[in-house]
């Protein structure tokens, strides 16, 4: 697949079968942790 | 309750690129835990997965087709969306968006009700 | 990619029938394994989710289980609304892949 290049390790750890499950984890931890970035940089 | 419609053009012709829009009402496409889903099936066969997308953006192809495809998500307008280049009669098929998420082990617990797609040459 | 191989690819019987449909992967898949049932014209809907778990407002007759690369769909009394076509899937990991269908006729 291809999301932008801030997701090419997660596309990439697909050659080695990661399943669906620990994907969603990786994308949902991943938006997490961008919703608290933008949080914080707009608490500035 | 969730749903989803299909939307797009009913007749593409051959080498042309086929487009289709998912709308997702009655709930929320920026929801975690869900994958967004397109699914195709030729006229008297089986279910093919074309690719997903998550809510983020992160795309998900069927490696047979992925050189030809693309799905984005706009979910401003609570949409997703697949691009198809390249098409041939072999892409003739009722179209199927649906959502797979964690609530359900991954399978696609909704789904539209599918697009005929005719590929002409 | 992960195969999946459904057979029969289609059976007949009769109202009241046990039909037994079974579907085995490729790679051990533990319990990401989903049934669905599709009628003429329609979408497919999610009988069985987990290999085992029933989904809501599906008759209990329905039944699905195994896990790792051998899974069953059971029905147990086959009613006259059930005659559809079947199909497995596995979600454990991507691509997605369907089994081949199982076609439940009227004998």
């Known amino acids: 697949g291809g999301g932008g290049s801030k997701h090419k390790c997660v596309q990439n750890s697909l050659v080695n079968n990661e399943t669906l499950e620990s994907i969603m984890n990786t994308l949902e931890s991943e938006e997490d942790f961008r919703k608290y970035f933008y949080y914080l940089e707009g608490s500035k | 309750e969730v749903q989803l419609v299909e939307s797009g053009p009913g007749l593409v012709k051959s080498s042309e690129t086929l487009s289709l829009k998912c709308t997702v009402s009655?709930?929320?496409?920026?929801?975690?835990?869900?994958?967004w889903g397109w699914i195709r099936q030729p006229p008297g066969k089986g279910l093919e997965w074309i690719g997903s997308i998550h809510r983020s953006g992160s795309t998900f192809y069927n490696p047979s087709l992925k050189s030809r495809v693309t799905i984005s998500v706009d979910t401003s307008k609570s949409q997703f969306s697949l691009r198809l280049t390249s098409v041939t009669a072999a892409d003739t098929s009722v179209y199927f968006c649906g959502r797979h998420g964690r609530d359900y082990y991954y399978g696609m617990d909704v789904w539209g009700q599918g697009t005929t797609v005719t590929v002409s040459s | 990619d992960i195969q999946m191989t459904q057979s029969p690819s289609s059976v007949s019987a009769s109202v009241g029938d046990r039909v037994t449909i079974t579907c085995r992967s490729s790679q051990d898949i533990n319990n990401w394994l989903v049934w669905y049932q599709q009628k003429p014209g329609k979408a497919p809907k999610v009988l069985i989710y987990?290999?085992?778990r029933l989904q809501s407002g599906v008759p209990s007759r329905f039944s699905g289980s195994g896990s790792g690369t051998d899974f069953t769909l059971t029905i147990s009394s086959l009613q006259p609304e059930d005659f559809a076509t079947y199909y497995c899937?596995?979600?454990?990991?991507?691509?997605?892949?369907f089994g081949g269908g199982t076609k439940v006729e009227i004998k």
């Open positions: 899937q596995q979600a454990n990991s991507f691509p997605l892949t």
């Open positions: 987990g290999a085992s």
């Open positions: 009655g709930g929320s496409i920026s929801s975690s835990g869900y994958y």
